[in-house]
Each structure stands twice: as structure tokens, then as C-alpha cells.
């Protein structure tokens, strides 16, 4: 495989050295200005010190300039996501310069070798940017480096080496192996640009994490917790999108970052929001749907600059395909129990009814366990915009079918054979929309009928004004 030589990152194909025709030394990195929406078009190759191609290819010095940086490659060809991203950028920013950084010869190697080449590729990009800065009207502030996987760290090096500060770097699932826990100057970091935003879509706490787990930007967004992406499971991929193996599942999840970014470019009317949270579990509990103090942001291209934040972890749920936007809701449910039946967790579902649409039957995911005689918070999300919420239906499906729960059922039955029934009392549900930040309280229609048992349902409507004042007494006062 070809390897770089010298500080300029020159390339020689050692594999074919004996042939005289193979010893020609060439720059290891090429810059292709995509001049047409036609993905087959060869574009224009730019090189430092050669101004003619800039004129011939109508390089717009005052416009935004995007540099797309691919990652490690097993095939040595540009993957299909590349022209999708190029096309999306052209669609969104019609006057912009879109440059593809072709470092395929240095990326088409053993992963460890490709990692060792990232620095030299970053240097090449920095040299190109330094040269462009010599031109009138070109501003580094208008430069946006978009790096996928290993390319994200290349972007970091470029931002580090360039004279001045690049406007923005977007890291699309930055590579994890050999970068996790690395020194700030040996990976993408917030210091590499005026604004560094990152999408993490393949992080794993067990096994090999293809994407980096640690936050490396000003804002680090973890869609679906940054790990299992909807539509990328083996079941989903076997019958579609040409992904039929574990390798393809990995590819699907890793590449999801690119598609989320493309989505943010082309579906401007359906922007996805992410919410700041300390960890994925807290987000899954529905605790983190606040937009106060810049705690929420658009994802992808539409992300708002937040330079005061560093390594701010943000979360969201998404659909399985474009448009990825979902609508997040926080449900605060105060649960009392008439008959506490041990550790068995109820399997609860909610259906939301809105002015525009109704949701499906949505599971209330129990992240840890339901606390009785306490307020429990849940996160639910819908794929469609329901509009204003009008009412909701809560159903109890009985116990979750795990061996643990079945054993608990049996144990509880043995300990209280005379009273095996279980009952929850839920008087009201407070709902907050993540997208609109609106809060609405829903009450049972009849305060005296607020109990639910397995196999039953309970309906909630918007609370009447003053309902809470009238019903201040606890339903349990006479139960002693």
C-alpha cells in the first residue's frame, strides 16, 4: 500500500516500485471542487500555487466553502454517502464552494496506517487554506470542514495547523479506535475551530466502539443515545438497503451521522432538536427536555453556535429514515399504589390524541423502576406532529414478560395469595413538549375513577381550570 514520505505527505507506491512507470511521486491529497450537481462530473482539481483552476472553475471567494473529508476505506473508492452530501450542500447553499478532500490512497490501508496518515492529510488541508487566505476576499471564517469518521480527526488536525481559526468543523461520528481518550492535539477538539459540533451515532461501551464515545466538540450530539440507531438492526437491514451482515449493521449506524447531517440540509422545514443532558439514561427517563439557558439546539447544519459550551452532551430520538425528526414529550406521572405487589413493574402504554393527529400506542419505558407514591418521569416520542394535545389514554398491559418479573409474580402470589390484584392510582399527568416547550396538565375526567389495573385503560383530558384547587385532598386520606 502507498505510504506518505516527508513532511509534505508525498506518496510513492512501494508495492509497484520495480516498474519505472510507478515511481512518479505525487501529492498524496487531492482537492476536488465539485462544480456540478451531476455526481458523475469530474469536477475541478485545485492545487496550492495554481490560481488558474480557481478562475476556470468559478471558485467563489466570498461564499461559504465546505471541505468534505472522508474516512478510512476498505474499497479505495468514494462511498455512496459522498455524493449525497455534496448534492445536499449544493441544494442548501447554492453559491457555496464544495470541495472533496481525496486522501483515498492514504486511507485505503490498514486502519492503523490510515490513522498515522491523518496528521499529514490535515497538514495538506491547512496548506490549501493558508494559500486560499492569500487571495482577496477569502475568509477562514466562511470555511466549514465536514469530516466523517477518521476524516473528523483529519479536520481537527487541519483546524489546528491552519494559520488563523476555521469557522466551523462538523465531526460526523468521529472514529473511536486510537482516538478515545487521546490528547487534545491528537484528535478533534473544541480548539480546532470557532465552532465544533459533533454527531455520535456508533458508540459502544462494550466491544469495539467504531465511533468515539467521549465528547470532542463544543456540542456533542448523541442521537438515540449514540448507539443503536433505528432501522439499522439486523432485522431491518437484512431486507433493505443492501446491509445483510453485522458489518453492514455497523456501517449503517456509523454512516447514520452523515444522513442526519444531510437531512438537516435538505429538510429545513423538519429540524431535529437535541437536548442537553448529563447522560443517556437521564434523557431516556425524560428528565432533559429543557430549552432554558441554551439547553436545546438544532442538530446538523442548523446547529446554533455555542462557543461558551465545551463537550456539552446532547440527546434526541430519531425516526429510522429521512426525515429523521420526531416530537419529544416529557410525561410526569404521579403514581400511588393501593396494592403494592413487590418489585413487579407495570407495562404501561400511552396514546396521545392531538388536533392534527393521534399517536400510536407508545410504551412508557421504565429505565430503572417505577417509584410508587412519587412522581415518575417518562420520555415518549411521536413520528408525526400531533398539534395541540387534547386527551390521552393510558393502558396497563400486565407484567413485562421477563423471567425476573414472572418469578416476582409467582413469589408475590405466594406471599399474598388472598390479594393478588394490583392497582395504581394516577390522578394527573403533566406533559411537556420538547419542541414547543409547552406544558399541559391532563386529569382523569372523574377524580373518583383514577385507578388502573392490568388489562385496563384510563382516559385523561386537559384539566379544567381550578380542578387542582378543588381537589387538594389526597385520595388516600381515608384508606388507613
Amino acid at each position: 500500500s502507498p505510504v506518505p514520505f516527508g513532511p509534505e505527505g508525498r506518496l510513492e507506491d512501494k508495492l509497484h516500485k520495480p516498474k519505472a512507470t510507478q515511481t512518479e511521486v505525487k501529492p498524496s491529497v487531492r482537492f476536488n471542487l465539485r462544480t456540478s450537481k451531476d455526481p458523475e462530473h469530474e469536477g475541478c482539481y485545485l492545487s496550492v500555487g495554481h490560481s488558474q483552476p480557481l478562475e476556470d472553475c468559478s471558485f467563489n471567494m466570498t461564499a461559504k466553502t465546505f471541505f468534505i473529508i472522508h474516512g478510512w476505506t476498505m474499497s479505495g473508492i468514494f462511498e455512496n454517502w459522498l455524493h449525497k452530501l455534496v448534492s445536499a450542500l449544493h441544494t442548501r447553499e447554492k453559491d457555496a464552494n464544495v470541495v472533496v478532500v481525496d486522501w483515498l490512497p492514504l486511507a485505503h490501508q490498514l486502519y492503523t496506517d490510515a490513522v498515522n496518515n491523518t496528521r499529514v492529510v490535515g497538514h495538506s488541508i491547512a496548506r490549501m487554506l493558508d494559500w486560499l487566505q492569500e487571495k482577496d476576499d477569502f475568509s477562514l471564517g466562511n470555511v466549514h470542514l465536514i469530516g466523517y469518521s477518521l476524516g473528523a480527526h483529519v479536520a481537527g488536525y487541519a483546524g489546528n495547523f491552519v494559520k488563523g481559526t476555521v469557522g466551523r468543523i462538523t465531526g460526523l461520528d468521529p472514529a473511536g479506535p486510537m482516538f478515545e481518550g487521546a490528547d487534545i492535539h491528537k484528535r478533534l477538539s473544541p480548539d480546532d475551530a470557532d465552532f465544533v459540533d459533533v454527531l455520535h451515532t456508533y458508540t459502544r461501551s462494550f466491544g469495539l466502539s467504531i465511533g468515539i464515545q467521549m465528547p470532542v466538540g463544543h456540542i456533542d450530539i448523541y442521537p438515540n443515545g449514540g448507539d443503536f440507531q433505528p432501522g439499522c438492526g439486523l432485522n431491518d437491514v437484512l431486507g433493505s438497503i443492501a446491509y445483510g451482515t453485522i458489518t453492514e449493521v455497523v456501517k449503517c449506524e456509523h454512516e447514520r451521522a452523515v444522513h442526519l447531517f444531510v437531512d438537516s440540509l435538505v429538510n429545513q422545514d423538519k429540524p431535529s432538536f437535541a437536548f442537553q443532558c448529563t447522560d443517556s439514561n437521564r434523557f431516556k427517563k425524560g428528565i432533559c427536555l429543557s430549552c432554558r439557558k441554551n439547553r436545546c439546539n438544532n442538530i446538523g447544519y442548523n446547529a446554533k453556535k455555542m462557543r461558551k459550551k465545551r463537550n456539552s452532551k446532547m440527546y434526541l430520538k430519531t425516526r429510522a429514515g429521512m426525515p429523521f425528526k420526531v416530537y419529544h414529550y416529557q410525561l410526569k406521572v404521579h403514581m400511588f399504589s393501593y396494592n403494592n405487589s413487590g418489585d413487579t413493574q407495570p407495562t404501561l402504554y400511552i396514546t396521545l390524541y392531538g388536533s392534527n393527529a393521534d399517536s400510536q400506542n407508545l410504551p412508557l419505558e421504565i429505565v430503572e423502576k417505577i417509584e410508587l407514591n412519587a412522581t415518575n418521569t417518562f420520555l415518549v416520542y411521536t413520528e408525526e406532529d400531533l398539534g395541540d394535545l387534547l386527551k390521552m389514554r393510558l393502558t396497563w398491559e400486565g407484567v413485562a414478560h421477563s423471567w425476573y418479573n414472572l418469578w416476582n409474580e409467582f413469589r408475590n402470589y405466594l406471599s399474598q395469595p388472598s390479594n393478588p390484584s394490583r392497582e395504581l392510582y394516577i390522578r394527573r399527568i403533566r406533559v411537556k413538549s420538547g419542541e414547543t416547550q409547552r406544558k399541559v396538565t391532563f386529569c382523569t375526567q372523574d377524580p373518583t375513577k383514577s385507578s388502573i389495573s392490568p388489562g385496563q385503560e384510563l382516559w385523561f383530558h386537559k384539566c379544567q381550570d381550578g380542578w387542582k384547587m378543588k381537589n387538594k385532598t389526597s385520595p388516600f386520606v381515608n384508606l388507613a
Epitope: Q22, P39, S75, F78, N80, L104, I241
Partner: antibody
């Protein structure tokens, strides 16, 4: 106009070596990848692999690893296919075909083909 | 590797009629709304010639009587009305992401 012109027919004995050329014109040679495709007599098309015309890095499919070598003479805008230790089953017509690095990788221009006959 | 199965292996169609050739892939060749399936025509003693790219796009200079359709795993090449010069062997090819890229076995079209 864009053309890929291949070298003439070859008659070889088993165990010998052959080198087929494919000269490109009408476009910037290094801006497109070059494929090689085999077609045995009366059979279908079989993709052998491709070469990056800029870096010179070849990629071979599993069936064509070992005796087959893709190479370049960039200054002459020419790609080569060399087959070593020829066998009877190498008797076929070999085509070069270009593809765009940036698009959907279909083969838009083909050489006229070089017929190789391997016989003792 | 993705296997492409063409059917029929050969067909005879009367002048002016419709010829329909099918290509089935062993797994989807779609990617984000695009189908990476292409069709070529090869006449005896000649190299293949690109007719249709990305399932349904007509290559420039190819007559409009050629059309392609399909997505996922099922693709079709239609020729209507068939002309004398269309007698040839037709191949489908997939180039979805990582190689190896593969060709179908070919369909020989004869004009009655």
C-alpha cells in the same frame, strides 16, 4: 471525443505472460478510475477489479488475485493488464472501462476489447 | 457478493413489440433513494454499451425506446417498440458501495 483504445489480439502458450494496454484520450486520465472486465467465449461479463489512475493503487476481485496485475503509464494515459503464467481458461476477451470516482460508478466508456487465446 | 439473476436467458420479440428483461438481486442495491443498477447492451464482436444508469436514467445518445425501472432487488429493462438493431445481449450490473461489483448472466434478444 472520449476513447479507450486497446492493444491487438494475442495468441499465447500456457505458462507465458501477456500485457494488454488500454490508451485513453479525450479526458483527463487521472480523473477517472479504470476497470478491467473479462468475457470468456460465449459467456457473460466478469468484473476483474480496477486501478486508481491517480495513485496507481490496484484492487482485484478474489478470482483475479495472484497472476493478474494492473498498472499504469500515466504520462501516456495508458492502463495495462498483465497476466502471468497463462492458463487455457484465461482465453477470453478483456475489456477496459472507465468510471467516475465521484458518482454511481457505472462504466460509461469501454475499450473495444482485446482477444487473448491461450493454447499449446 | 451480490448475485444478479437475469431472466429470461433469451427471448424472441416481433418487430415493434415490447421486450421486457428482468434482473433480480440477491439483496437490495438501493442506497438512500438511489438504485445502483445499470443496464448495458452488447452486440457480437463489440464492447458493452451503457444504456441505463441508476435504474431509470437514460444515458445520453440512447433512444427513448429504452427504459429502466425498479428498486430494491427487482429491476426491469423495457424496449418498446423493438427495432431490428436491438438484437443483442443485455446485461444488468450493480455498483452498490463496496466492491465486488457484479454483472447479471445476460439476456439474448432476438428479433422475429
Amino acid at each position: 471525443q472520449i476513447q479507450l483504445v486497446q492493444s491487438g489480439p494475442e495468441l499465447k502458450k500456457p505458462g507465458e505472460t501477456v500485457k494488454i494496454s488500454c490508451k485513453a484520450s479525450g479526458y483527463t486520465f487521472t480523473n477517472y478510475g479504470m476497470n478491467w472486465v473479462k468475457q470468456a467465449p460465449g459467456k457473460g461479463l466478469k468484473w476483474m477489479g480496477w486501478i486508481n489512475t491517480y495513485s496507481g493503487v490496484p484492487t482485484y476481485t478474489d478470482d483475479f488475485k495472484g497472476r493478474f496485475a494492473f498498472s499504469l503509464e500515466t504520462s501516456a494515459s495508458t492502463a495495462f493488464l498483465q497476466i502471468n503464467n497463462l492458463k487455457n481458461e484465461d482465453t477470453a476477451t478483456y475489456f477496459c472501462a472507465r468510471f467516475s470516482y465521484y458518482g454511481r460508478h457505472y462504466f460509461d466508456y469501454w475499450g473495444q476489447g482485446t482477444t487473448l487465446t491461450v493454447s499449446s | 457478493d451480490i448475485v444478479l439473476t437475469q431472466s429470461p436467458a433469451s427471448l424472441a420479440v416481433s418487430l415493434g413489440q415490447r421486450a421486457t428483461i428482468s434482473c433480480k438481486a440477491s439483496q437490495s442495491v438501493d442506497y438512500d433513494g438511489d438504485s445502483y443498477m445499470h443496464w448495458y447492451q452488447q452486440k457480437p464482436g463489440q464492447p458493452p454499451k451503457l444504456l441505463i444508469y441508476a435504474a431509470s436514467n437514460l444515458e445520453s445518445g440512447i433512444p427513448a425506446r429504452f427504459s429502466g425501472s425498479g428498486s430494491g432487488t427487482d429491476f426491469t429493462l423495457n424496449i418498446h417498440p423493438v427495432e431490428e438493431e436491438d438484437a443483442a445481449t443485455y446485461y444488468c450490473q450493480q455498483t452498490n458501495d463496496d466492491p465486488p461489483w457484479t454483472f447479471g448472466g445476460g439476456t439474448k434478444l432476438e428479433i422475429k
